[in-house]
């Protein structure tokens, strides 16, 4: 059992609204119907998360791009690494929710 | 647009199943009636991620503790600092799926 | 950092059997396979069998299916190969190595090796 | 199994040499070609995978090619550090087999 307090302006700090690293399931419906498997069968990006000071706030990527990744392709009759590409957040604010 | 291509290897490094950190809302449920509002309304913490090698193996925690944090607590008539406990994994392992 | 380390020597008598161990840290063992390498005194590389600490599969190459058995200890983040009825043709240097993935195999980080001497 | 050959078995080169190592296959491998270094002490690193993706960490002047059965390492610039001894393996099929590996001496 853990004794020590992470204190408040830590916590705080932490869950703030920014890119942070995120898993992310692949979807083999991308990939047609060759594909029989993706290896990894997820990959990490740095996407927005975290909390806003506020509960009318919602936490938004304001700064985006694609990022581009090598991923195996098990197929038939042969398999290869081919290449993804996904969304990663650069930026990121706490904006006021839609209505 | 990103020109560089992330190395497999790279990228499986990265998904593969460990702690990582992990954003958590944080429910008022567990708090009672008193308190209107918690800051801030989510935290971090370690918890297992990512996937395995192998489709029949899943990622699941074998080592896990308890980490106390600060939390602002919004009530009436006085607002304090409290402390809130969450689950963190410290060690993680690919498990075969029950079936 | 990923790690695998393995003892430095082992020293055999003919017809007897040993234990290598290889033990990992810095990364998830079960998220990896375990493979055995063998090079015999200025010789080339030899795939001996891999093994997966997850579930405990293993592959063995046909050539090393009698002699050798893999097995991991999960709790120790450790793989074991255990190598039966040796002779002097199996006095070598055996390596462990990881990898992800059963397809590519390309394995990224190797253990030291293990130099096995077998003599009477 | 598939038989992996480094016709090659030792080449001697200069210091700012560009040295290239041949790796042939007993059949189409589809670039599931991987090579290694060993060092004179025995430490083994991965350099290249699928032919020609660097693995981190290591520099730059390595490179791979090739298609098929016919794989190629390339260091452009040779530097005393690159002494050692380098394999290929192919990694198509099981089991995974090495080439006889190429010494790397200099001149």
């Known amino acids: 059992h853990q004794k020590k307090v992470v204190p408040w302006i830590d916590v705080y700090a932490r869950a703030t609204c920014q890119p942070r690293e995120v898993v992310v399931p692949l979807s083999m419906e991308l990939m047609g119907n060759v594909v029989k498997q993706l290896v990894p069968s997820c990959v990490t990006v740095q996407r927005c998360g975290g909390c806003c000071p506020d509960d009318g706030l919602e936490c938004v990527p304001t700064g985006q791009h694609q990022v581009r990744m090598q991923i195996l392709m098990i197929q038939y009759p042969s398999s290869q690494l081919g290449e993804m590409s996904l969304e990663e957040h650069s930026q990121c604010e706490c904006r006021p929710k839609k209505k | 647009h990103q020109k560089k291509v992330v190395p497999w290897i790279d990228v499986y490094a990265r998904a593969t199943c460990q702690p990582r950190e992990v954003v958590v809302p944080l429910s008022m449920e567990l708090m009672g009636n008193v308190v209107k509002q918690l800051v801030p309304s989510c935290v971090t913490v370690q918890r297992c991620g990512g996937c395995c090698p192998d489709d029949g193996l899943e990622c699941v925690p074998t080592g896990q503790h308890q980490v106390r944090m600060q939390i602002l607590m919004i009530q009436y008539p006085s607002s304090q600092l409290g402390e809130m406990s969450l689950e963190e994994h410290s060690q993680c392992e690919c498990r075969p799926k029950k079936k | 950092q990923v790690q695998l380390q393995q003892p430095g020597t082992e020293l055999v008598k003919p017809g007897a059997s040993v234990k290598l161990s290889c033990k990992a840290s810095g990364y998830t063992f079960t998220g990896f396979w375990i493979h055995w390498v063998k090079q015999r005194p200025g010789q080339g590389l030899e795939w001996i069998g891999h093994i997966n600490p997850g579930n405990g599969g293993t592959n063995y190459n046909e050539k090393f299916k009698r002699m050798a058995t893999l097995t991991v200890d999960k709790s120790s983040s450790t793989a074991y190969m255990q190598l039966s009825s040796l002779t002097s043709e199996d006095s070598a240097v055996y390596y462990c190595?990881?990898?992800?993935?059963?397809?590519?195999?390309?394995?990224?980080?190797w253990g030291q090796g293990t130099s096995v001497t077998v003599s009477s | 199994e598939i038989q992996m050959t480094q016709t090659t078995s030792s080449l001697s080169a200069s210091l700012g040499d560009r040295v290239t190592i041949s790796c042939r296959a007993s059949?189409?491998?589809?670039?599931?070609l991987n090579w290694y270094q060993q060092k004179p002490d025995g430490t083994v690193k991965l350099l290249i995978y699928y032919t020609s993706t660097l693995h981190s960490g290591v520099p730059s002047r390595f490179s791979g090619s090739g298609s098929g059965t016919d794989y190629s390492l390339t260091i452009s610039n040779l530097e005393q550090e690159d002494i050692a001894t380098y394999f290929c393996?192919?990694?198509?099929?099981?089991?995974?087999?090495f080439g006889g590996g190429t010494k790397l001496e200099i001149k």
């Open positions: 059949q189409d491998i589809s670039n599931f």
């Open positions: 393996q192919q990694g198509k099929t099981l089991p995974p087999t």
């Open positions: 190595a990881r990898s992800y993935s059963n397809y590519v195999r390309a394995m990224d980080y």
